[in-house]
Amino acid sequence: GSERTCCPVNWVEHERSCYWFSRSGKAWADADNYCRLEDAHLVVVTSWEEQKFVQHHIGPVNTWMGLHDQNGPWKWVDGTDYETGFKNWRPEQPDDWYGHGLGGGEDCAHFTDDGRWNDDVCQRPYRWVCETELDKASQEPPLL
């Protein structure tokens, strides 16, 4: 067929997207590259429903998403508009905190232990979630 009808092995299908949940940690840029090599991107949260789905799978663990402001304004990695889109920041976040002593501020967004978002130092080795739209996934049958 011209489109894939199910997700690759070890990926979870939800609302026409496939999700992969890491069980180890990487810096944000390395997590971003991981998803890209898998023909995916770091998860882009576009609704409260998607937020709850991801939150259910990651549990109370700091986890990178595909949102950053390393070049100035906040941007989603797939081009989804940040200003008009879904947001779920913790109170008083993002704050670009410089007090961590690691140099610079905080340019990468992650899910916190309660699922709400925080900005943090991009080098921290957090878990991550990859996402790919089902009709953009590889055009082959699922791996056996």
Epitope: P8, N10, W20, S24, G25, K26, A27, A29, D30, N33, Y34, R36, L37, E38, D39, P125, S138, Q139, E140, P141, L143
Partner: antibody, heavy 119, light 107 residues
Framework: EVQLLDSGGGLVQPGGSLRLSCAAS????????MSWVRQAPGKGLEWVSA????????FYAESVRGRFTISRDNSKNTLYLQMNSLRAEDTAVYYC????????????WGQGTLVTVSS | DIQMTQSPSSVSASVGDRVTITCRAS??????LAWYQQKPGKAPKLLIF???NLQSGVPSRFSGSGSGTDFTLTISSLQPADFATYCC?????????FGQGTKVEIK
């Protein structure tokens, strides 16, 4: 049985170009990221480039960025490495390799093809 | 770039010996490490992935351990087919980098 067959190597002058090919069989080619690795004579292994299964994302070592281009034709089950502006230090055996999903190790390798850059 | 340093650079051993090769990363790579065996004129062969997972078809005398920055490849009882060069590779961050190799020679 998974097989990778490297070809396209040869003798080329500095500044010249060459295109390497890697013909794959025995697995669903488009489902796997692929990579090129090289080994200069008597030296260790050096990662050169990688490409995602659908070909939309590519990655390069700094030593080849802007000169080499990795690509793939999934309809032909073939991986390519276009090498331009070749230098003497690019002389090496070039191997293509299949990448294990999720783990990112190279589980199958081609037999290698020798590229010699010399005047 | 992450530097991978192997030690020793070569080791002389006899059949039946236990051989240990170490690999150190210049920064933490969790368990994103692979080990390969290479014989002269041949392509490398994957032995271990994810630091400790034995690749299918590889004899159980090979094992890997470690996490973070320090890793070990152990051959529990060296066999004639094991005389070769072994190298580690980190796949945590691009550019992926290899160790310089450890040559296991016959004593």
């Amino acid at each position: 049985e998974v097989q990778l067959l490297d070809s396209g190597g040869g003798l080329v002058q500095p500044g010249g170009s060459l295109r390497l090919s890697c013909a794959a069989s025995g697995f669903t080619f488009s489902s796997y990221a692929m990579s090129w690795v090289r080994q200069a004579p008597g030296k260790g292994l050096e990662w050169v480039s990688a490409i995602s299964g659908r070909g939309g994302n590519t990655f390069y070592a700094e030593s080849v960025r802007g000169r080499f281009t990795i690509s793939r034709d999934n309809s032909k089950n073939t991986l390519y490495l276009q090498m331009n502006s070749l230098r003497a230090e690019d002389t090496a055996v070039y191997y293509c390799a299949k990448i294990i999903r999720e783990q990112w190790a190279f589980d199958y390798w081609g037999q290698g093809t020798l590229v010699t850059v010399s005047s | 770039d992450i530097q991978m340093t192997q030690s020793p650079s070569s080791v002389s051993a006899s059949v039946g010996d236990r051989v240990t090769i170490t690999c150190r990363a210049s920064q933490g790579i969790s368990n994103w490490l692979a080990w390969y065996q290479q014989k002269p004129g041949k392509a490398p062969k994957l032995l271990i992935f994810a630091a400790s997972n034995l690749q299918s078809g590889v004899p159980s005398r090979f094992s890997g351990s470690g996490s973070g920055t320090d890793f070990t490849l152990t051959i529990s009882s060296l066999q004639p087919a094991d005389f070769a060069t072994y190298c580690c590779q980190q796949v945590n961050s691009f550019p992926w980098t290899f160790g310089q190799g450890t040559k296991v020679e016959i004593k």
